[in-house]
């Protein structure tokens, strides 16, 4: 069933992961370094999915992702044979009001105690992930081990 | 069975409004699952969306027509209506009013179909 | 122009097997949408064939199937009958649209 009440504005958030790195906009990508002085991590733009009838169930709250104030959304899409992290230029509002859910644009976003993971609607079993090693782009992993990072605590913004 | 009968009149003059109505019968226009819609066809071309709405009176409209497109409902009748304003003889068409059904991961597609009604833009 | 690019007309001789293309892009069929499929009789409404690419509503003949890769849909009849002779539309989602999209409809011949 949609959801009756329409919301005007997404929710902002702040993101970290578990060693205390921020996601930081360069060249038009995101990264993931240790916060320091002076430094601008990005703030999070989040929505819920209206349609979430026609989603997966029990997965996790489907939600789009974007960068606030910067009309910049994440989406998942295939290079080759490879699903790949990307952003586009998008407004978040736009993909909330469309009468389909935008499965490349889409999240489900699952919390467990005070971590987050976000694992790709269009591709399930593919996660937002950041290398362990730190200062790499955003990535989309398969792979819940070491050498990746797919825990993030959300803060929200009030 | 679900059925749908499109009704309003067959002629409208330019610069002014179209009207129809839908008047569903055999079921519910209040099911939490289905949208219901319309859909256009000019004569001998193909289908367009114009838009739909839920029972709540959540509405989404083909974004090229949307200025002009209102539809409404009314559950304690089991209809839903269609307006659009200032039509043109581009507007010529038969009108289709649909149920819009879901399936999880798959787009809403249009089931059953009314019969359709002819409308034509002419002074 | 329509969004989804079908051929204008297809034919075929009785008990032949014909297929009709939808042909879209990375914004609609590319983008996880699925493909839907009606038919429109001649002076009728169009009638639900094919949904979510593959599935067939009860009362719909198996000589009707449908598949999707990538960007592009079919619809296939085989077994061809006088009575299949109709219009074909497929339909889908377009997001950079925000609407419900169709091919701009193929015409079937049974020779």
């Known amino acids: 069933m949609e959801k009756a009440l329409k919301i005007d504005t997404p929710q902002q958030g702040s993101i970290q992961d578990i060693n205390h790195r921020v996601w930081v906009l360069q060249d038009q990508t995101l990264i993931a370094v240790p916060r320091k002085d002076r430094m601008s991590p990005v703030t999070i733009a989040l929505i819920s999915c209206r349609h979430v009838e026609t989603l997966e169930k029990d997965r996790g709250n489907p939600i789009y992702l974007g960068l606030n104030g910067l009309n910049l959304c994440l989406m998942c899409a295939k290079v080759g044979d490879q699903p790949t992290l990307q952003l586009k230029e998008k407004d978040i509002m736009d993909l909330y009001n469309q009468p389909e859910p935008v499965k490349s644009f889409l999240f489900y976003h699952s919390q467990s105690g005070r971590n987050s993971t976000f694992e790709s609607v269009a591709f399930p079993g593919w996660f937002i992930a950041v290398s362990s090693e730190g200062g790499c782009p955003l990535i989309l992993t398969q792979e819940l081990g070491k050498a990746n990072t797919t825990d993030f605590g959300l803060t929200m913004l009030f | 069975e679900l059925q749908l009968q499109e009704s309003g009149p067959g002629l409208v003059k330019p610069s002014e409004t179209l009207s129809l109505t839908c008047t569903v019968s055999g079921g519910s226009i209040s099911t939490s699952s289905d949208y219901w819609g319309w859909i256009r066809q000019p004569p001998g071309k193909g289908l367009e969306w114009i838009g739909s709405?839920?029972?709540?009176?959540?509405?989404y409209y083909l974004p090229s027509l949307k200025s002009r497109v209102t539809i409404s409902v009314d559950t304690s009748k089991n209809q839903f209506s269609l307006k659009l304003s200032s039509v043109t003889a581009a507007d010529t068409a038969v009108y289709y009013c649909s149920r819009v059904r879901y399936g999880v991961g798959v787009p809403r597609y249009f089931d059953p179909w009314g019969q359709g009604t002819l409308v034509t833009v002419s002074s | 122009q329509s969004v989804l690019t079908q051929p204008p007309s297809v034919s075929g001789a009785p008990g032949q097997r014909v297929t009709i293309s939808c042909t879209g892009s990375?914004?609609?069929?590319?983008?996880?949408?699925?493909v839907h499929w009606y038919q429109q009789l001649p002076g009728t409404a169009p009638k639900l064939l094919i949904y979510g690419n593959d599935n067939r509503p009860s009362g719909v003949p198996d000589r009707f199937s449908g598949s999707k890769s990538g960007t592009s849909a079919s619809l296939a009849i085989t077994g061809l009958q006088a009575e299949d002779e109709a219009d074909y539309y497929c339909q889908s989602y377009d997001y950079s649209l925000s609407g419900y999209v169709f091919g701009g409809g193929t015409k079937l011949t049974v020779l």
């Open positions: 709405i839920y029972y709540t009176g959540n509405t």
């Open positions: 990375s914004s609609n069929i590319g983008a996880h949408y699925d």
